[in-house]
Interface confidence: low
Amino acid sequence: VPGEAEQPAPELVEVEVGSTALLKCGLSQSQGNLSHVDWFSVHKEKRTLIFRVRQGQGQSEPGEYEQRLSLQDRGATLALTQVTPQDERIFLCQGKRPRSQEYRIQLRVYKAPEEPNIQVNPLGIPVNSKEPEEVATCVGRNGYPIPQVIWYKNGRPLKEEKNRVHIQSSQTVESSGLYTLQSILKAQLVKEDKDAQFYCELNYRLPSGNHMKESREVTVPVFYPTEKVWLEVEPVGMLKEGDRVEIRCLADGNPPPHFSISKQNPSTREAEEETTNDNGVLVLEPARKEHSGRYECQGLDLDTMISLLSEPQELLVNYVSDVRVSPAAPERQEGSSLTLTCEAESSQDLEFQWLREETGQVLERGPVLQLHDLKREAGGGYRCVASVPSIPGLNRTQLVNVAIFGPPWMAFKERKVWVKENMVLNLSCEASGHPRPTISWNVNGTASEQDQDPQRVLSTLNVLVTPELLETGVECTASNDLGKNTSILFLELVNLTTLTPDSNTTTGLSTSTASPHTRANSTSTERKLPEPESRG
């Protein structure tokens, strides 16, 4: 075209993919009449007429731009919609009158790439490799033009370094015209890189300026040889029988070697391999004193067959032996004295306590409990607790039952029971003594006995309420070789003015079930009488 060399540089119009480019024809009135303009696209130096303006009216030419062009700004501006990367070219407008002049516009197209996707080499990298190995791959999809990639390690940009760092980038053009960038970071890593954080950054331009997107941070598996193996015991601190103890082998290499844990046989002094779980952990559960001893760990590198041995570790499982109490089954008369002695062995200093079983009250701190002037109430359970004060929870106990010779002793002397005629009553009577008493009833019925403890017995009786029974009441008698004792249960008819028939309240210590003869059962609860009772 004549005079093209003198033409000024084209005006630059920048636009993002998918948006609308406004191509303003920059011809001045002197250069041409904007009501009579031809628009061309220039691709590979070939001009193609794409739009005509005649008397201010626009008309698209058939072809790739036919559907995307329209006239704006009273004919001075050509709008190109749905811009694609292929639209990055020169557009020119040519005025026909008074003489043929043209104005060129360079359209630049941009598209931000997607978030970079980083994939670490899942196979990992050995530290002793001869040349850089693939660390990670970074992919930035659908950007335009091609973004730049920068790799970072621990926040610092990585530069190409001969035989140490190599960055291999390639790109593909999608059918959309957008670029997908793939960058592979290759590096020689050292042991300290096992915790290193790698990421990639895409730098790209938009009409608004320069931008960047960062990938997530990744760490790469780094393989390095084991230099040291050691044992670790959990929990830390003093161990006791019953604990769950885990002995594990640890190594400073990756992958860790194949571990085996051995315990020194105290008699042969030979190391004997222990059975570990799938994770190579020796679990002692529950730990026993026999587990005490010297443990060591062997780490075998299955590639090199190099074996490393840990320093031995002495394991002490603290214990308290079975507790022995003497005398084991003491029997005493009322008013006498009794000395109870407790013995046990332990790996640590022991502390002894004597407790009353029924109340939990501490009676003595020490192995010897002296009981003087024994009363009947002193009969029952005494528990010796042997504990290691420096190891909370390490203790053993032994219960001894002290029997005080004496005649039966009744839980109650008298009791009132509210009843209805023709009901089946469930009555109970409790007595204690040594030897343990037996209980009999003064009426016919179904009786059963339960031993509550070595000196105490509970008897229950099911009986039908009759007029005769209401008259006589019910007696239970407890007897042993030393004597007998009686409790009386007074039966009283429920009065409608005092109680509703369904409430069936009774008084006394235990529970009575009162059921109407040939009717459904109902329960009556006995409550203790308010006035003091003799328990003779």
Partner: antibody, heavy 119, light 108 residues
Framework: QVQLVESGGGLVQPGGSLRLSCAAS????????MSWVRQAPGKGLEWVSA????????YYADSVKGRFTISRDNSKNTLYLQMNSLRAEDTAVYYC????????????WGQGTLVTVSS | SELTQDPAVSVALGQTVRITCQGD??????ASWYQQKPGQAPVLVVF???NRPSGIPDRFSGSSSGNTASLTITGAQAEDEADYYC????????????FGGGTKLTVL
Amino acid sequence: QVQLVESGGGLVQPGGSLRLSCAASGFTFSSYAMSWVRQAPGKGLEWVSAISGSGGSTYYADSVKGRFTISRDNSKNTLYLQMNSLRAEDTAVYYCAKDHDYGGFIDYWGQGTLVTVSS
Amino acid sequence: SELTQDPAVSVALGQTVRITCQGDSLRSYYASWYQQKPGQAPVLVVFGKNNRPSGIPDRFSGSSSGNTASLTITGAQAEDEADYYCHSRDSSGTHLRVFGGGTKLTVL
């Protein structure tokens, strides 16, 4: 024989930071819990922090919780105490200490390093 | 949790002195006892029920009852003049530790 040598003490302004180190020798370092204990001038001993042999468990006195961090490097037989947000009342001789075999109490002490917090 | 010690105790040369330490934690744990001389690091003298590290004279002994631990020096020597500290785990059952306030022993 057991040796514990502290370093890193010195003068620091309130709000500042300091890192104490303790080089240990003469015993299997990784098998023992270690502690830091301090002693303000003319005052008694105050337990500061402890760490298990593996470094997996750490314990702190209420007075330093959130400000001090105990750590260890078993490969270097070294115990550390990172002290941040220092206050005047942190001024003391700081002792590195080794736990007894039983655990729960101390059997060997270093000679201490003086930390002075003053503007 | 706290361990309480008398601030100062004195003893005549060759006599017996008892230094006490009170605290809830002593119901569950034994106290360990440390001797500290001016300008020096503390030294363990008694631990556990009544154990002495090697090199500690047998005039030092320990005992415990309830929530009180005691350090007894039988036949105190001039070189025993020092500060004595008791030490125990915290009564909360955690791995926290605690020291007593210290007792200044003067040998007259």
